[in-house]
């Protein structure tokens, strides 16, 4: 089975994936993300996403010798975006142009909006089963950042996915660093 897969979505409304709770210890996990998109203008060819760029992540979760029975699905909120109030002015200037001229002091980024606690089962090599709670992202939102924000709060870095089984080939991806916790 695959270690992870990502489907890029550009929807504004996302139904929660059937998944769900909170915890204490760290869970080794695969995490998918997106490239950091930047743009210098508000033209039709801009690579800044309208609304939020949502990645549908599918991954297996591993805890030592135990691996999730099924892959877990969740959203990864990544990249730059435009808030919905700006969208009507996307073409033809107006407020959108004024907003964009201030980009040096503020930017909009796609961040986690809604999360859900999810119980999952892990199958262990010794035949036993474990259960944990993790937190999964179910919706993204466009949030404004200014120079006052710590740059590291929305930087991207390279993260290695978890290897749920020995035969899984490790693949590096640029992603937001984030860890699920167990309880």
């Amino acid at each position: 089975f695959k270690n992870d897969a990502t489907e890029i979505l550009y929807s504004h409304v996302v139904k929660p994936v059937p998944a769900h709770p909170s915890s204490n210890s760290t869970l080794n996990q695969a995490r998918n993300g997106g490239r950091h998109f930047s743009s210098t203008g508000l033209d039709r060819n801009s690579r800044v996403q309208v609304g939020c760029r949502e990645l549908r992540s599918t991954k297996y979760i591993s805890d030592g010798q135990c691996t999730s029975i099924s892959p877990l699905k969740e959203l990864v909120c990544a990249g730059e975006c435009l808030p919905l109030p700006v969208l009507p002015n996307w073409i033809g200037g107006g407020y959108g142009t004024k907003y964009w001229s201030r980009r040096s002091s503020q930017e909009w980024r796609c961040v986690n909006d809604k999360t859900r606690t999810q119980r999952i089962q892990l199958q262990c090599q010794d035949g036993s089963t474990r259960t944990y709670k993790i937190t999964v992202v179910t919706a993204c939102k466009c949030k404004r950042y200014t120079r006052q924000h710590n740059e590291s709060s929305h930087n991207f870095e390279s993260v290695s996915p978890a290897k749920p089984a020995q035969h899984h080939r490790e693949r590096k991806r640029a992603s937001k660093s984030s860890k699920h916790s167990l309880s």
Epitope: P16, I69, R119, S128, T131, Y132
Partner: antibody, heavy 123, light 107 residues
Framework: EVQLQQSGPELVKPGASVKISCKTS????????MSWVKQSPEKSLEWIGE????????TYNQKFKAKATLTVDKSSSTAYMQLKSLTSEDSAVYYC????????????????WGQGTSVTVSS | DIQMTQTTSSLSASLGDRVTISCRAS??????LSWYQQKPDGTVKLLIY???RLHSGVPSRFSGSGSGTDYSLTISNLEQEDIATYFC?????????FGGGTKLEIK
């Protein structure tokens, strides 16, 4: 076959404590959260809390946080609930109920229930 | 906490009838809605999870539907063994909460 066998009825005095057991069989005990539910005529069904048999960590309904303590004994695949400082309002039937999983994912339903333990608080 | 309301506390129906029991949540519960059957002897069984998915071993005459805040359980061809009290339960947000129950009786 999955089975949750609860301990017998209890008649206790006000102010006392009681410990109810739920012995499980037919499945991997550590692979499923265990919930406890109270049923009284006045309040229908109320979720008390849940415990993760893997870690022993528990989550409580705020209403029962000072009343109930959930524990497990992995060696005997048994879950326990202790109720303290009992009053007449604690007189009810208490159920243990296993978290349901479908292909390893929970949909927050309880798929198997014990037969219930009646607790009567009376002087 | 999310309030779950079953407006009909009891209803009478004839064998063979199609019966629908409704349940309303005080806020959107994203389909995390389960239905349970409690027999007169106190035995509780899960019927439906995640709004419409049938738990293993449950007869196909039971079905569930709904979305947002409004959900329902339907028994398509009422049988004697279906005489029980039915509870809905939301699992979208902790604490889990239950409806007050609907007692089903034979007319």
């Amino acid at each position: 076959e999955v089975q949750l066998q609860q301990s017998g009825p209890e008649l206790v005095k006000p102010g006392a404590s009681v410990k109810i057991s739920c012995k499980t069989s037919g499945y991997s005990f550590t692979g499923y959260y265990m919930s406890w539910v109270k049923q009284s005529p006045e309040k229908s069904l109320e979720w008390i809390g849940e415990i993760n048999p893997t870690t022993g960590g528990s989550t409580y309904n705020q209403k029962f946080k000072a009343k109930a303590t959930l524990t497990v004994d992995k060696s005997s695949s048994t879950a326990y609930m202790q109720l303290k400082s009992l009053t007449s309002e604690d007189s009810a039937v208490y159920y243990c109920a296993r978290e349901g999983y479908y292909s390893g994912i929970s949909y927050d339903a309880m798929d198997y229930w014990g037969q219930g333990t009646s607790v009567t608080v009376s002087s | 906490d999310i309030q779950m309301t079953q407006t009909t506390s009891s209803l009478s129906a004839s064998l063979g009838d199609r019966v629908t029991i409704s349940c309303r949540a005080s806020q959107d519960i994203s389909n995390y809605l389960s239905w349970y059957q409690q027999k007169p002897d106190g035995t509780v069984k899960l019927l439906i999870y995640y709004t419409s998915r049938l738990h293993s071993g449950v007869p196909s005459r039971f079905s569930g539907s709904g979305s947002g805040t409004d959900y329902s359980l339907t028994i398509s061809n009422l049988e004697q063994e279906d005489i029980a009290t039915y509870f809905c339960q939301q699992g979208n947000t902790l604490p889990r909460t239950f409806g007050g129950g609907t007692k089903l009786e034979i007319k």
